[in-house]
């Protein structure tokens, strides 16, 4: 947010940039929270635009019985590992095909015990205020599906008839991590010392971090003909004087006609 200055007063302005603003030779460059010629005004809305998507990661272990473990599988750049990764990924894509939040799998480690596959199942959903519920539901479906497939696709007479076979007892969910997004917390942090006066309101499921000086929201302060200005003690209405009226009151809703006042004074002289 920048305000340009022209003329002789500019040098003077340079030394007067407020609130951490810096002079660039032409104008005060204001930090995110401020604007105005001298960075003296506090913004009424802060962009806390949520991420487009929210991710979750499930740490799982399954035991693949249809492949015999070899030392080469420990080396992630080996032909063996690369092939295992391709087949395992293809198999998991089939298993989780009905889950819209499913993105893919990432093998972290292969170890002996038939082939014990430590891997992450990656989930992603479009941001909405209900993202936690959406991802919680998806993780439950992942658990159901992996439990089902590792129970059904098993070796019979030491031979697998499926793309991959598993040990039913080797399936474990170690950990589930969901990317945390807390708009209220972000809003408070970004508003710094004005944090008590900024709130999050939703419009079309998108969060907006606003002060009461931002018009058009349920918390908006109506200053009528005045101007809403944020200070450390909260939002205040700065009332205007027009050619005909003085305005006063907390919301500048009390107008006094100048002619009446002048007339009254005149009468006293």
């Amino acid at each position: 947010r920048t305000t340009t200055c022209f003329g002789d007063g500019c040098q003077n302005t340079a030394s007067r940039c407020k609130n951490g603003g810096t002079w660039d030779g032409l104008k005060c460059q204001c930090p995110n929270l401020y604007y105005g010629e001298l960075c003296e005004e506090v913004v009424s809305s802060i962009d806390i635009g949520p991420p487009e998507t929210i991710s979750a990661q499930m740490e799982l272990t399954v035991t693949v019985t249809s492949v015999k473990f070899t030392e080469e599988l420990k080396n992630h750049s080996s032909q063996e590992f690369q092939e295992f990764k391709q087949t395992f990924t293809e198999q998991m894509n089939i298993v989780y095909s009905g889950i819209p939040e499913y993105v893919g799998v990432n093998i972290t480690k292969l170890r002996l015990g038939s082939v014990v596959v430590e891997h992450d199942v990656l989930l992603r959903t479009k941001y909405t205020p209900e993202y936690k519920t959406v991802l919680d539901n998806a993780t439950e479906v992942v658990k159901e599906k992996i439990t089902k497939v590792t129970t059904q696709q098993i070796m019979i007479n030491d031979i697998c008839s499926d793309m991959m076979c598993f040990n039913t007892t080797g399936t474990q969910v170690q950990n589930i991590t969901v990317t945390q997004y807390d708009p209220e917390e972000d809003c408070r942090k970004m508003a710094k010392e004005y944090g008590d006066y900024f709130v999050v309101e939703y419009r079309d499921q998108k969060p907006y971090c606003i002060s009461p000086c931002e018009p058009g929201f349920s918390v908006s302060k109506n200053c009528n003909l005045g101007k809403c200005q944020m200070s450390l003690s909260g939002p205040q209405c700065l009332c205007v004087t027009t050619e005909t009226h003085w305005y006063s009151g907390e919301t500048c809703n009390q107008g006094t006609q100048k002619s009446l006042v002048y007339g009254h004074h005149h009468h006293h002289h």
Partner: nanobody, 124 residues
Framework: DVQLVESGGGVVQPGGSLRLSCAAS????????MAWFRQAPGKEREVVAF????????YYADSVKGRFTISHDNAKNTLYLQMNSLRAEDTAVYYC?????????????????WGQGTMVTVSS
């Protein structure tokens, strides 16, 4: 990348024999799996036999047990299928398949590398 080239197909009378070969190249290890699959017209591809090149395992489909023998020559990197006592129902395109893993699955989807196939016709 792994390349597989089959040869040895042809027309043979019932009760006769044939030997199929499959030359493999592109492996970084000398321990891997190789298999023979076949596909008859209008039918799904099915396993005939597989072998681990370290000699650790061989497998035969019930329909060919005692008649077919799978083997592998490590020095030549070549897979063989000796087919004896051939029957009309053995008529199919025979495919060589390979994996750098020691596989124990007969599902063709688990086998990533394939030859172009060689036709075997058993007919009088």
């Amino acid at each position: 990348d792994v390349q597989l080239v089959e040869s040895g197909g042809g027309v043979v009378q019932p009760g006769g024999s044939l030997r199929l070969s499959c030359a493999a190249s592109g492996y970084t290890s000398n321990r891997y799996s190789m298999a023979w699959f076949r596909q008859a017209p209008g039918k799904e591809r099915e396993v005939v036999a597989f072998i681990w090149t370290d000699g650790g395992r061989t497998y035969y489909a019930d329909s060919v047990k005692g008649r077919f023998t799978i083997s592998h020559d490590n020095a030549k990197n070549t897979l063989y299928l000796q087919m004896n006592s051939l029957r009309a129902e053995d008529t199919a395109v025979y495919y060589c398949a390979a994996s750098s893993l020691l596989l124990q699955t007969i599902n063709p989807r688990a086998w990533p590398y394939w030859g172009q196939g060689t036709m075997v016709t058993v007919s009088s």
